[in-house]
């Protein structure tokens, strides 16, 4: 544990006034693992007065920090840039003088406490104010900050000429863009203090470019990925005081793909598994031993899950018998193009004979089986497929 | 070499006031937290209160609140302990000491008598 | 405010171990520490932090402190370890300091 503090598992306190600590506790090596601290706590520690970039990284999985009636001078910018799961920040009763909107832009804090400290009243501190105005009033705190005469001034009243929020404006054209195209997206920010303008991208996966000039930026996607489809795009204007964005959605047209097709699975149903796809969205055409599939309450294609282009579904089949081996073909289809795949099935060898060593013998299909338009949709057609040996449906669960 | 050295003996009426002090050297007087401790004839240790001659920040055991001040001066290096207005159970023997780490450097002790 | 507990009185004679406890609510989640006062002397630091022993304070003083019991350890005893013993934690907001145990040296 750190010299001066105790430690448990998930939890460490500095509180005990002497000798107190000078820097923000680490643990020694090959003691307790620093990703399971899960709360720090800091008291009546005069001569800690400040927190490095390095300080708390290794308390990745920290959520609550308190550190009160001490000496916090500084916190360095990035002192909490690895600690994503902070939630509870409390500094009540330091030295702080300024404290920094980037200092906790990325985290999703539920409390941030900071009465007591010797704030400056400058434009610094203004995004404090807006915070509290923008927090419900149970919430609200009693900030003060230290004006020119030194003299206390509630937070409330704070007016700091030329600082203010910024504000971002995207120019975008319609952002529906067929795969492997390029597109340009344009912006501009501004405010006082100027903001500085970039770009959020978040997990695009187009190659992109940036430019950036004083309050105007471009971005540009080029051989735009299918991937991308649904991910949106942010131009972020920030200052002192706080950010503004504005927001765009990619949407990316490209023809279908089968990316899986599996063999029947056997659960409450039998399933031909299979993965698609394709923006828009495709439609389905099954067939059997080459001929349209049309499907009915027996067999029937269902789309268990959405993920925006992609769609996860079965032909699902109630009780097939040996009549029902064969070969069956997807085919998805949109504006852009088609594919298909296909796969043999085998539910049950024929009564009587051993399939393995006589796989000669007629096949069929229900009747009543229909086509789809598109998926989930099931439409009665009327282009059934003759049979010679239609199956016995009296045993059929309904 | 660390001292704290502490003012002399008091012989005091009830109801008077009384100021004691606390003079540090040999160290940072600002970067070391003070304390005071009473010891009634007799009897043990009582823990009063707490000074941080930096920026004078206090706390008081719950039993001395309200009964006591405690005040430092760091341009002297020197912290002080007063009553307002004495009674004759404040008669004890007054320590203050040094904190950093436990208390390592103590006072020679004040003296106060109280009675009538 | 917590409340240390020690025993009133300890006896042991010269070149033995005395133990003297301190007892407290979570006493092991705190910081211990021990003072030896001598009569009409100002109370020594003779252990802080549950274990650590100040320079200049001999090796057979020793310390430890879990769940609600911290414990001095007196090895080797000689007669000038003779006096009171006072434990001493940060409980929250203020400093408390135990009952007080007379060791004396048979």
């Known amino acids: 544990c750190p010299t001066s503090c105790k430690c448990s598992s998930a939890r460490i306190w500095c509180t005990e006034p002497s000798p107190g600590i000078v820097a923000f506790p680490r643990l020694e090596p090959n003691s307790v693992d620093p990703e399971n601290i899960t709360e720090i706590l800091i008291a009546n520690q005069k001569r800690l007065e400040i927190i490095n970039e390095d300080d708390v990284e290794a308390y990745v999985g920290l959520r609550n920090l308190t550190i009160v009636d001490s000496g916090l001078k500084f916190v360095a910018y990035k002192a909490f840039l690895k600690n994503s799961n902070l939630r509870h920040i409390n500094f009540t009763r330091n030295k702080l003088t300024s404290l920094s909107r980037r200092h906790f832009r990325h985290l999703d804090l539920s409390d941030l406490i900071l009465t007591g400290n010797p704030f400056t009243c400058s434009c610094d501190i203004m995004w404090l104010k807006t915070l509290q105005e923008t927090k419900s009033s149970p919430d609200t705190q009693d900030l003060y900050c230290l004006n020119e005469s030194s003299k206390n001034m509630p937070l409330a009243n704070l007016q700091i000429p030329n600082c203010g929020l910024p504000s971002a404006r995207l120019a975008a054209p319609n952002l529906t863009v067929e795969e492997g195209k390029s597109v340009t997206l344009s912006c501009s920010v501004g405010g006082d203090p100027l903001p500085t303008l970039y770009w959020d991208v978040g997990n695009l996966v187009s190659k992109h470019m940036n430019e950036t000039s004083h309050t105007q930026g471009s971005l540009r996607i080029t051989n735009i990925s299918s991937d991308d489809s649904g991910k949106q795009i942010s131009c972020v204007a920030e200052n002192l005081v706080g950010e503004d964005q504005d927001s765009v959605n990619l949407t990316v047209h490209f023809a279908p793909t089968i990316t899986f097709l599996e063999s029947p699975t056997s659960d409450h149903h039998w399933c031909i598994p299979f993965t698609v796809r394709g923006n828009p969205k495709p439609a389905l055409q099954w067939f059997y031993n080459g001929a349209i599939l049309n499907e009915s309450k027996y067999i029937c294609t269902k789309i268990h899950v959405t993920n925006h282009t992609e769609y996860h579904g079965c032909l699902q089949l109630d009780n097939p018998t040996h009549m029902n081996n064969g070969d069956y073909t997807l085919m998805a289809k949109n504006e852009y193009g088609k594919d298909e795949r296909q796969i043999s099935a085998h539910f049950m060898g024929r009564p009587g004979v051993d399939y393995e060593t006589n796989p000669n013998y007629p096949e069929v299909l229900y009747e009543d089986w229909t086509t789809p338009t598109d998926i989930g949709d099931t439409t009665n057609k009327s282009n059934e497929i003759p049979s010679t040996d239609v199956a016995d449906q009296s045993n059929r669960e309904h | 070499e660390v001292q704290l050295v502490q003012s002399g003996a008091e012989v005091k009426k009830p109801g008077e006031s009384l100021k004691i002090s606390c003079k540090g050297s040999?160290?940072?007087?600002?970067?070391?937290?003070i304390g005071w401790v009473r010891q009634m004839p007799g009897k043990g240790l009582e823990w009063m209160g707490i000074?941080?001659?930096?920026?004078?920040?206090?706390r008081y055991s719950p039993s001395f609140q309200g009964q006591v001040t405690i005040s430092a001066d760091k341009s002297i290096s020197t912290a002080y302990l007063q009553w307002s207005s004495l009674k004759a159970s404040d008669t004890a023997m007054y320590y203050c000491?040094?904190?950093?780490?436990?208390?390592?450097?103590w006072g020679q002790g004040t003296l106060v008598t109280v009675s009538s | 405010q917590s409340v240390l507990t020690q025993p009133p009185s300890v006896s042991v004679s010269p070149g033995q171990t005395a133990s003297i406890t301190c007892s407290g609510n979570k006493l092991g989640d705190k910081f211990v520490s021990w003072y030896h006062q001598r009569p009409g002397q100002s109370p020594v630091l003779v252990i802080y932090?549950?274990?650590k022993r100040p320079s200049g304070i001999p090796e057979r003083f020793s310390g430890s402190n879990s769940g609600n019991t911290a414990t001095l350890t007196i090895s080797g005893t000689q007669a000038m370890d003779e006096g009171d013993y006072y434990c001493q934690t940060w409980d929250v907001s203020s400093y408390v300091f135990g009952t007080g145990t007379k060791v004396t040296v048979l």
């Open positions: 000074i941080y001659p930096g920026d004078s920040d206090t």
């Open positions: 000491a040094r904190g950093s780490g436990g208390y390592d450097y």
């Open positions: 040999g160290y940072s007087f600002t970067s070391y937290w």
């Open positions: 932090e549950d274990n």
